[in-house]
């Protein structure tokens, strides 16, 4: 075969947002018949030559960026896309509110505001049922999340997290849920 082997996939189960002391499994998936997997934590000297890493209790220093690759014969694959494993519950939960209120008419405007007692500069908004918040970079890094021209699709349960840019994979506990109701 010419060229590198195709990259494997790397996922965190049940989620890449992991509360402290809760379990998570990292799984590297390549094609059938792989000779060797290598799963590594970036910016660290640690790696393992296995496809699955079971973390029975999430710890702060296990948060960060992971990637994996595999070997067939003497050929190594391209590395997987990076997986960002986030530890949640490291800090107290922020509060989430809606301005002017959590009930909004279709076509109206609403702003979701995340507030923390820490001097954190980073926030993530998460709508139940959506992908994890870091899959939506446009939603990062602001305490205020304006939603212009609300539609029925914006209805749902929202939570926010706060964190520091100094330790971007150590997040607060989630805020209490905010139910956004779109009427009309």
């Amino acid at each position: 075969q010419s060229g590198p082997l195709p990259k494997p996939s790397l996922q965190a189960l049940p989620s890449s947002l992991v509360p402290l002391e809760k379990p998570v499994t990292l799984r590297c998936q390549g094609p059938p018949g792989v000779d060797l997997y290598r799963l590594e934590k970036l910016s660290s000297s640690r790696y393992q030559d296995q496809a699955v890493l079971f973390i029975p209790a999430m710890k702060r220093s296990l948060a960060g960026r992971y990637r994996c690759s595999y070997q067939n014969g003497s050929l190594w694959s391209l590395p997987s896309d990076q997986l960002e494993l986030v530890a949640t519950g490291v800090f107290a939960k922020p509060s989430l509110s809606a301005q002017p209120g959590p009930a909004v008419s279709s076509g109206g405007d609403v702003t979701l505001q995340c507030q923390t007692r820490y001097g954190f500069d980073q926030f993530a908004l998460y709508k139940e049922g959506d992908p994890a918040p870091y899959k939506n970079p446009e939603r990062w890094y602001r305490a205020s999340f304006p939603i212009i021209t609300v539609t029925a699709a914006h209805s749902g349960t929202y939570r926010c997290y706060s964190f520091s840019s100094r330790d971007p994979y150590l997040w607060s506990a989630p805020s209490d849920p905010l139910e956004l109701v779109v009427t009309g």
Partner: antibody, heavy 116, light 102 residues
Framework: EVKLQESGGGLVQPGRSLKLSCTAS????????MSWVRQAPTRGLEWVAS????????YWRDSVKGRFTISRDNAKSALYLQMDSLRSEDTATYFC?????????WGQGVMVAVSS | ADPNSTLLSASVGDRVTLNCTAS??????LAWYQQKLGEAPRLLLY??NSQTGIPSRFSGSGSGPDFTLTISSLQPEDVASYFC????????FGAGTKLELK
């Protein structure tokens, strides 16, 4: 070569304060959690405190909570342990160590003696 | 030395086994350290059996509450104290085993 060097130990009276420092070299300091671990002849090895790589998160063993503060200066590759309201049971050799869970590099240690 | 530590005597070339039992299931969240007199501890193994660039005569096994550090052929330079440490629930060290030559 990874090196950790502690300083600031000494003999101090109960209730007084002491600040330990640890200077790191040979690795990218800002990539790693750092910790303090102590060793007393009567109590063996005890984890004291840890701090995250960026310094936003820090935590301590219950017996030193509210008295000890761990901090770091990544620009100087330095780790600190501010020890206030010292007690005789804090007497030990204090080690600076790299990591939060297991500790893959250690300094040589600095002696802290709390006695009247 | 810690008054709760144990003493083990063995001869050069012996296969030496050190045991560590945690008070609960700690999965594989266990490390082993070697500490020579007047020196800092040195990490030998983490995650129960992952090596750190140490001599191949050192190996680790176990999972749950019961773990073992094995030295396949004892050398004079292995005279030291050995500690296990669990980091599943908090972070605690065992009292240690002082290994000496017969």
């Amino acid at each position: 070569e990874v090196k950790l060097q502690e300083s600031g130990g000494g003999l101090v009276q109960p209730g007084r304060s002491l600040k330990l420092s640890c200077t790191a070299s040979g690795f990218t300091f800002s990539d790693y959690f750092m910790s303090w671990v102590r060793q007393a002849p009567t109590r063996g090895l005890e984890w004291v405190a840890s701090i995250s790589s960026g310094g936003a998160s820090a935590y301590w063993r219950d017996s030193v909570k509210g008295r000890f503060t761990i901090s770091r200066d990544n620009a100087k590759s330095a780790l600190y342990l501010q020890m206030d309201s010292l007690r005789s049971e804090d007497t030990a050799t204090y080690f600076c160590a790299r990591g939060e869970l297991d500790f893959d590099y250690w300094g040589q240690g600095v002696m802290v003696a709390v006695s009247s | 030395a810690d008054p709760n530590s144990t003493l083990l005597s063995a001869s050069v070339g012996d296969r030496v086994t050190l045991n560590c039992t945690a008070s609960q299931n700690v999965y594989k969240n266990l490390a082993w350290y070697q500490q020579k007199l007047g020196e800092a501890p040195r990490l030998l193994l983490y995650s129960a059996n992952s090596q750190t660039g140490i001599p191949s005569r050192f190996s680790g096994s176990g999972s749950g509450p019961d773990f073992t550090l094995t030295i396949s052929s004892l050398q004079p330079e292995d005279v030291a104290s050995y500690f296990c440490q669990q980091y599943y629930s908090g972070n605690t060290f065992g009292a240690g085993t002082k290994l000496e030559l017969k």
